[in-house]
Amino acid sequence: EICGPGIDIRNDYQQLKRLENCTVIEGYLHILLISKAEDYRSYRFPKLTVITEYLLLFRVAGLESLGDLFPNLTVIRGWKLFYNYALVIFEMTNLKDIGLYNLRNITRGAIRIEKNADLCYLSTVDWSLILDAVSNNYIVGNKPPKECGDLCPGTMEEKPMCEKTTINNEYNYRCWTTNRCQKMCPSTCGKRACTENNECCHPECLGSCSAPDNDTACVACRHYYYAGVCVPACPPNTYRFEGWRCVDRDFCANILSAESSDSEGFVIHDGECMQECPSGFIRNGSQSMYCIPCEGPCPKVCEEEKKTKTIDSVTSAQMLQGCTIFKGNLLINIRRGNNIASELENFMGLIEVVTGYVKIRHSHALVSLSFLKNLRLILGEEQLEGNYSFYVLDNQNLQQLWDWDHRNLTIKAGKMYFAFNPKLCVSEIYRMEEVTGTKGRQSKGDINTRNNGERASCESDVLHFTSTTTSKNRIIITWHRYRPPDYRDLISFTVYYKEAPFKNVTEYDGQDACGSNSWNMVDVDLPPNKDVEPGILLHGLKPWTQYAVYVKAVTLTMVENDHIRGAKSEILYIRTNASVPSIPLDVLSASNSSSQLIVKWNPPSLPNGNLSYYIVRWQRQPQDGYLYRHNYCSKDKIPIRKYADGTIDIEEVTENPKTEVCGGEKGPCCACPKTEAEKQAEKEEAEYRKVFENFLHNSIFVPRPE
C-alpha cells in the first residue's frame, strides 16, 4: 500500500495506526509533539520499507527506540528535504537509540540528530554506508559518547558479531543497538545491495532484496519502480512521479489536489508528472496537461479588489511578487524605507502591464523608477481626474524615470502630469513623452518647467576617462579635468564603482534616497595643480572581477536662479587582473583497489581567473595503530554515568584538567584561549542552530482550528 502525500502524526500517539498498511510513504513522515509518555511497544509497522521524502521526529515523549516501530524501514529517498535533511531527530527526550537496523540507504540529503538528551549508539553507526556524503551531517547535543558506553552485540562475551569499519581513524564495531549489528554487504557487491544471506542484489535494487540478482525482488528501487520491476528509466508512455515510480498519463490526469491551483490538474513535462509547470514554462492552453516555454517571464495576472493598489511599504509591494500583469491602478507612496529600491525591484520588477493608471506621489525615498524594470505598457483603461494615466507629484529626490536608452514604455491612453519634482530634469520628462507616445497629449500646465528640476544640474557635460591601469586588486583611473564657465562652481568629483558581471548596469541601480546604494562612492578633491588630471586608485578589489565605474563632478547647482551645467562620465567597465585561486573544496579520496586512490574535489570558491589545470600531490603516511579507546571490560575505564540535559555546552572539566599543553612545559595547565577564528566559528554554529530551530518551529506549528 502506498500512503501519502506525507503523513503528519501529532498530539495523539494513537494516530500511528494510520501507518498500519503502509509499505511506501509517498512523501514525508512527521511524528511530533506527543507530550504524554506512552507505551509504544504495541505499535509496530513491519510493512513500511520506504519513505520517499524525509523522516522527522520531534518531541515524542516515551519513545525509546525506532527499531520496534519501523523494523524494516530500508530507504529514505530524500526526494524533498527538510532544511537539507532527510532524517531529523530533534529534542526526543526519551530516545535511547535510533535502532533503525534495516536502514541501508538515504539517497539524498544529510541527517540532523540534535538535543536528544538520552540518545546513545550514535558513534557506533557508520553513516557513510548509508549516505553518499557524511560531511553535512549534524550530530550535536546528544548524550556524550563517554557516558553511553555503547556495546555492540557479543563484545562483552568477546564473541563480537558485528563488522568493523573506520570512522575518523577509529576502527570499530558497527551496530545500531546492543543486539543489532549494522548490516554490511560483501565487498564483491560493490555499490550493490545484498540479501540477508549476503548475496548481491540486482544493480537496480536499493537497500536490500529478497532474492539475488532479480529486479522484481527489490525492497526498493535505485531509480524507478514500474509494474513490480525496478527499472533504470521509465518505459515509453509512462512518466516519473515523486522521484521513485512510473505512472501513465491516465494516472497523472486523475490526481486530485487540495491546492488552490488545482483547477487544471497535474501536468506532464520533461518525462515527469508534476503538479505545475516548472519555472519558465506555462500550460499549453487552460485544460492542457503539457507545458511550453514562456516568452520572457511567465504571465501572472494580479488583481486588486479595490481597483487601486497602494504601495507604501515593502510589505505592500510583496503582494505583487511574480506579477506580470496588474489589473488595476498603482499608487506609489514610499516616504521612507531600508534598501527600498532593491526591495521594490524584487517584488515589482516583473510587472509588464498596468491596465489602469500609475501615480507616484510624496515618494521621497525614490531616486529612480527603474525598480519597475519590466514595465512596458500602461493601458490607461482607468484614469485620474483630468484624464491622467501617469501622474508624478512631489517626489523630492526623484532624479531619473527610466534609462530610456534601454526602455520601451507605451502609454496607450491618457496624459502625463509632472509637478514639484525638484531633482527631476525636464529633459528627462520630455524624453519620456517621446518614448511613450504621449507627445502632444499634454497641455501646457501638465509638465511644470519651473518646479521640476529646479534643484538639479540638468545640462550635463560628459567627462572623458584618459587612462586606466589594473592589477589583481587595484584599478587606477584618470579623467579630463572639467572646466565649468566659472571654476568656483566646481567643488570636487565623486567616483562610483561596483562589481558588474554584466555590462547592463545603470547609474540608479539599487539606489534610494534613504542611504541605500549599490554603488561604492569615493570623493576626489581637485588637484591643486591646474594642469594635473584628476584620478583615483581604487584598492581592495577582487581579482578577475569586472567593475563598473563612473565619475560625477560635484557642482553648485544654482547660481542666482540660473540652471548651471553639471558633468558626468559614461559608465566604464574594467576587469581586474587574475590572481592565485583559492583552495579546491571538498577534497575526498577513496581507494578502489590495493594500488589505486580515487581523489575527487570541487572547484575553488574563488577561481580568481580562468582555471586551466589542477596540481595533485600525494605522499605515503605511516598507518595509525592506535585503534582502541576504551576497554569496556575494565571497570575503572567505564565513565561515570551522568544524565545529559540535551543542551549543547562545553563539557564539564574535572578538577585537574589535562588539556592541550600551552607553551613548552608538559603537565596540567589551562586550556589555551580560543582564537578569533574559533570564536567566529562558534558564533556561526550557534547562529546556524538558531536558524534551523526557527525553521523547524515555523514549519510544524500550526494554529489551532477555530
Epitope: 500500500e1 502506498i2 500512503c3 501519502g4 502525500p5 506525507g6 503523513i7 503528519d8 494510520r18 498498511n21 503502509c22 509517498e26 512523501g27 491516465d250 494516472f251 486523475n254 490526481i255 486530485l256 489536489s257 487540495a258 491546492e259 488552490s260 488545482d262 483547477s263 490538474g265 503538479q275 482550528p705
Partner: nanobody, 123 residues
Framework: EVQLVESGGGLVQPGGSLRLSCAAS????????MSWFRQAPGKEREFVSA????????RYADSVKGRFTISRDNSKNTLYLQMNSLRAEDTAVYYC????????????????WGQGTLVTVSS
C-alpha cells in the same frame, strides 16, 4: 485532527435517488481532497468518488459514472454524494474520507475516515 460524520443513508427502491452528506470539523476543509468509499457486506472496501479541494475536479469509479455526482460546499464544510438510478449492487456502508494536500488514483489509505452510513437498495 479532522472529524467526519456521514448522514443521509437509508432504504431506497431500485432506480431511486439518495443524497449523502458528510460534515467535517477540525481543520480548514478546503485543504483536503475528499472521497467516498463503500463496503458491501462480505466485500473489500472500494473507491466510489473523489473531489479536489476547490471542488473543480472530480473522479469516479467506472461502476458509478453517470449515476453519482460528488460535490462540496467549502463554506459549510460539507461533502455530498448525489446518487441516482440506484441498483441493488449499490447496497453498502458508505464512508466519507479526507486526505490533506492531494490524492492519487491508487490511494486507499486516506488520513481521516467517518463512521459510515448504510445505504440499502431493495424493492
Amino acid at each position: 485532527e479532522v472529524q467526519l460524520v456521514e448522514s443521509g443513508g437509508g432504504l431506497v427502491q431500485p432506480g431511486g435517488s439518495l443524497r449523502l452528506s458528510c460534515a467535517a470539523s477540525g481543520r480548514t476543509f478546503s485543504s483536503f481532497v475528499m472521497s467516498w468509499f463503500r463496503q458491501a457486506p462480505g466485500k473489500e472496501r472500494e473507491f466510489v468518488s473523489a473531489i479536489s479541494g476547490s471542488g473543480s475536479r472530480m473522479r469516479y469509479a467506472d461502476s458509478v459514472k453517470g449515476r453519482f455526482t460528488i460535490s462540496r460546499d467549502n463554506s459549510k464544510n460539507t461533502l455530498y454524494l448525489q446518487m441516482n438510478s440506484l441498483r441493488a449492487e449499490d447496497t453498502a456502508v458508505y464512508y466519507c474520507a479526507a486526505n490533506p494536500r492531494r490524492a492519487t488514483p491508487d490511494l486507499t489509505q486516506y488520513a481521516y475516515w467517518g463512521q459510515g452510513t448504510l445505504v440499502t437498495v431493495s424493492s
